[in-house]
């Protein structure tokens, strides 16, 4: 829905950002008051069936009391109490609680798989392309390189973790400095939080759930941006990272540990390499100049192999070439000296899917990509719905008060440091910041978590990625040991102070403040959502990169200007929402840029018309089609997944009939209901009590 | 078997070119490398370059550089080895020998050896 | 040039003493080091190759060890037939360097 399409432009509540607000949120009004609970819904599924609700055109006529969007949804009980329940029904309750709590596990599984499986696909499509990015030799002159190189590379192979064992490899085999390393793990650290936000479009179904969990999606892009903002310059003029790491580094002597233990890939992997298994040295290859790899596919075909190793002999230009002095000697005509060989004899293939199809690479990617969103998407509506069903009345007053409130005075400030430890400690159970992070998303689009509460979460889970690495360091063989933990402590002491610039005093929370920003104007027009992905993950990278190639002189060209004008623009605002009198009448507001400058209706309109052609032909075959369809046409009724879309005109007709928000009605249920989502007959039996 | 002939004794002035034969037999003639070595009366052994008769690759000692030629003809299993601008100190037994062992500089066949005689 | 010092530059001994031979390179040469028997009156005879790999038909009396610079033939147990001058040689470099010999006789 579009409930409030004015807050586009609105200021956020500072007053909601306080120390401990996350807990202390006004919470809605009782609907009950507005709505005689489940007897009237009659109404508003009759004026939601004339409606196209899901168009961004739509204005929606609101309650007079107009709610803060931000505030949680009620998410009262529609099901018979507990105690009213015979032993039958208390029975079948019972046998239905276990029951849901079962597909919630095996959704969640299936969710988690397909992240992986996303994952490979990802670097199935652009591995070889991400490889090829880092043997660019510029890298180590210029560190707005090498952050962009992060970004694209992360964003391309779908994991932080590949792209920071690349510049691993690289740094011990003296290919990447340290120093140089820096800005691309600073980069890796932006592009692993795109995942989330992909899975956060999967939510973009309904209006107010969107909002929530697209917010809660890119507080993390934001914390990460806003770090590198300030942290990079920093580390370009002082090198602190590379300091402190070296100086921790130095001053232990470790011994090789062992492996970082994979909890959760234990669960997943035998079903992830069923689908798909990839050979990742391949891309290590690549970005180490090794020509013979750009030729290798990434898709694994054996899995048992037999390495011999033989030494053998080997002609060479001059004795300077040999192995070793003692490996040399001559025949009397050329000079020889001994080898190693690897000899590698395949015995046993992989068992998954692909490996007797031997597709290219992209093909196979374009198809893992394609099923595994489907995949994805599917996980995320069901696990949405399951959770909405079960966390209705005290269950769900339990968890959120749980989950969302604070310590009682004078400790209500250590909730969101613990949140932070949560965080990091489920990251490294999960061994993986995007699954956990991910897995955060549709719980606060469905409004069991707050996000004021999803931030401590989201950076905890920041920290927790590092530590992960830094027992995967530990457990590096020597050679590459040094450079691996000292990657990997630069990495956790980037995110570190990036906590200590913008979270422990409330007013520097400004990625809160930001996703919300986005969340609202994402909400409104959706498309947003998408050129927001598009725009920052890859147009401002490739641009960056681009230019950087292009020599210093382009960069800084270029770069200055749109620096400038950000700033200016950014004063400007400051100024404008603080003290406008000091500015002059003309520039108290936007009003003196032309409309398509200051607000996003006019794209909107260009937007509406390009999809145009997909609304008319916008055939809602099933809730995953559906959802994509949603965001790309904005289909008036493409959530009613029973039949295609009606006429535009018909739509159109209805535009400005008043229609109550679905926030205003009693529960999920209900509301869902009215959005042809849930049978009707399915509501007054639904069974709540776990 | 493996057999090595050589051409029979000489005797040269100083300053003249001597050209000593060594004609191959029981063995694949392009295979093994062909080395010189030389031995003055009661004296070392002293390696004065190699042949690889297949390309025509040659290996001397810095030592006789500019004054010593390798040739091999294929057709007759024969190698020639010409040593120009004689010193009486070239007087010597001269040696063709072959290594079979593959890629090493051990020479395990060796012919009878020609001696050459340097006098005024 | 790498230089090989042979000692002792003779030698006399019984029939059935154990004789060593020693070979001095004048820088590392791993074991590119090989071993030849040559008689009076004829060409020489290669004993062995790569310090201890005895070629073929060689009695295995004679055994050969070391490495880098170090480098030694023994004949366990003298024979008649064994009188000779031996030779050590390094193909590790061009131009492939002999020693100066090694005359075994008997007493």
């Known amino acids: 829905m579009a409930p409030w399409p004015e807050l586009g432009d609105a200021q956020p509540n500072p007053d909601k950002y306080l120390e401990g607000a996350a807990g202390q949120q006004p919470t809605a009004p009782d609907k009950s008051k507005e709505t005689n609970k489940t007897d009237n819904t009659e109404a508003p599924v009759t004026k939601i069936e004339l409606l196209p609700s899901y168009s961004t055109a739509t204005l929606i006529d609101e309650p007079t009391e107009v709610d803060d969007p931000w505030n949680l949804p009620t998410l009262q009980d529609s099901g018979i109490k507990w105690s009213e329940r015979d032993t039958k029904g208390k029975i079948l309750c019972f046998f239905q609680g276990i029951g849901r709590l079962i597909l919630l596990l095996g959704f969640l599984y299936f969710f988690v798989c397909s992240l992986d499986i996303l994952s490979s696909a990802f670097q199935l499509v652009g591995g070889k392309m991400a490889g090829q990015f880092f043997s660019n030799s510029s890298i180590m002159s210029n560190p707005l390189l090498g952050l962009v190189i992060g970004v694209l590379v992360t964003v391309l192979v779908q994991s932080s973790s590949t792209s920071t064992s690349i510049v691993v490899s690289m740094v011990s085999s003296s290919l990447l400095t340290v120093r140089a390393a820096i800005p691309i793990i600073m980069g890796a650290n932006i592009g692993t939080s795109i995942t989330n936000t992909i899975v956060a479009l999967m939510q973009v179904g309904d209006r107010s759930e969107f909002r929530r969990a697209f917010a809660g999606a890119t507080v993390h892009d934001f914390f990460n941006w806003l770090s590198v903002l300030v942290l990079l310059p920093v580390e370009v003029a002082t090198h602190y990272l590379e300091i402190i790491t070296q100086l921790i580094v130095e001053s232990f002597h470790f011994k090789n540990g062992e492996d970082a233990p994979d909890l959760l890939k234990v669960i997943t992997k035998p079903f992830t390499k069923l689908i798909v298994q990839l050979d990742k040295k391949v891309i290590s290859q690549i970005a180490m100049n090794d020509e013979k790899a750009k030729n290798k596919s990434l898709v694994k075909i054996w899995c048992k192999t037999f390495t011999n190793k033989t030494q053998i002999n080997v002609t060479v230009p001059s004795t300077a070439n040999c192995t070793s002095p003692s490996l040399c000697w001559t025949d009397g005509i050329q000079n020889w000296t001994m080898k190693n060989v690897t000899y590698k004899e395949n015995i046993a293939k992989c068992q998954h899917i692909f490996v007797n199809f031997h597709l290219p690479d992209l093909a196979v990617g374009t198809i893992l990509l394609i099923l595994s969103l489907l995949v994805l998407c599917g996980c995320l509506i069901m696990i949405v719905k399951i959770l909405g069903s079960v966390l209705k009345g005290q269950v769900a007053t339990v968890i959120k008060k749980t989950i969302n409130t604070d310590f009682p005075f004078p400790f209500a400030w250590l909730t969101g440091y613990l949140a932070i430890l949560v965080g990091a400690g489920m990251t490294f159970i999960v061994q993986s910041s995007s699954v956990f992070t991910s897995a955060l998303t549709p719980l606060i689009g469905i409004g069991v978590i707050t996000i004021e509460r999803a931030y401590p979460l989201t950076l905890g889970s920041n920290i927790g990625t590092t530590t992960t690495a830094i027992l995967a360091a530990l457990a590096s063989p020597g050679n590459a040991l040094r450079s691996s933990l000292q990657i990997a402590l630069c990495h956790f002491f980037f995110n570190i102070s990036g906590i200590l610039l913008w979270y422990p005093i409330p007013f520097t929370r400004l990625p809160i403040r930001m996703a919300k920003g986005l969340g609202n104007i994402s909400a409104k027009y959706r498309w947003f959502a998408v050129f927001y992905l598009i725009i920052f993950f890859f147009l401002i990278p490739l641009t960056v990169f681009g230019l950087s190639l292009a020599g210093w002189r382009v960069l800084v060209g270029v770069g200055v200007p749109v620096v400038f004008i950000i700033i200016l623009v950014l004063c400007l605002r400051l100024l404008q929402s603080r003290c406008p009198r000091v500015l002059p009448k003309k520039l108290q507001n936007w009003n003196f840029l032309p409309l398509w400058m200051r607000s996003l209706k006019p794209w909107d309109a260009v937007v509406s018309k390009f999809t145009g052609c997909f609304q008319m032909r916008c055939c809602c075959c099933c809730r995953v089609c559906c959802r994509a369809c949603c965001l790309l046409c904005d289909c008036p009724k493409c959530c009613r997944c029973s039949k295609c879309c009606e006429d535009l005109e018909e739509a159109q007709e209805g535009q400005d009939v008043p229609v109550k928000a679905p926030e205003t009605f009693d529960n999920i249920t209900i509301s869902r209901e009215a959005q042809g989502e849930v049978p009707a007959s399915d509501s007054k039996t639904e069974c709540t009590a776990l | 078997q493996v057999q090595l002939v050589q051409s029979g004794a000489e005797v040269k002035k100083p300053g003249a070119s001597v050209k000593v034969s060594c004609k191959t037999s029981?063995?694949?003639?392009?295979?093994?490398?062909m080395h010189w070595v030389r031995q003055a009366p009661g004296q070392g052994l002293e390696w004065i370059g190699a042949?690889?008769?297949?390309?025509?690759?040659?290996s001397y000692n810095q030592k006789f550089k500019g004054r010593v030629t390798m040739t091999a003809d294929t057709s007759t299993s024969t190698v020639y080895m010409e040593l120009s601008s004689l010193r009486s100190e070239d007087t010597a037994v001269y040696y063709c020998s072959i290594s079979t062992i593959i890629t090493t500089g051990a020479v395990d066949y060796w012919g009878q050896g020609t001696l050459v005689t340097v006098s005024s | 040039d790498i230089q090989m010092t042979q000692s002792p530059s003779s030698l006399s001994t019984s029939v059935g003493d154990r004789v060593t031979i020693t070979c001095k390179a004048s820088?590392?040469?791993?074991?590119?080091v090989a071993w030849y028997q040559q008689k009076p009156g004829q060409s020489p005879k290669l004993l062995i190759y790569w310090t201890s790999t005895r070629h073929t038909g060689v009695p295995d009396r004679f055994s050969g060890s070391g490495s880098g610079t170090d480098f030694t033939l023994i004949i366990r147990s003298l024979q008649p037939e064994d009188v000779a001058t031996y030779f050590c040689q390094q193909y590790s470099r061009i131009p492939l360097t002999f020693g100066g010999g090694t005359k075994v006789e008997i007493k």
């Open positions: 029981g063995y694949t003639f392009i295979t093994y490398n």
């Open positions: 042949i690889y008769p297949g390309s025509g690759d040659t």
């Open positions: 820088q590392d040469v791993g074991t590119a």
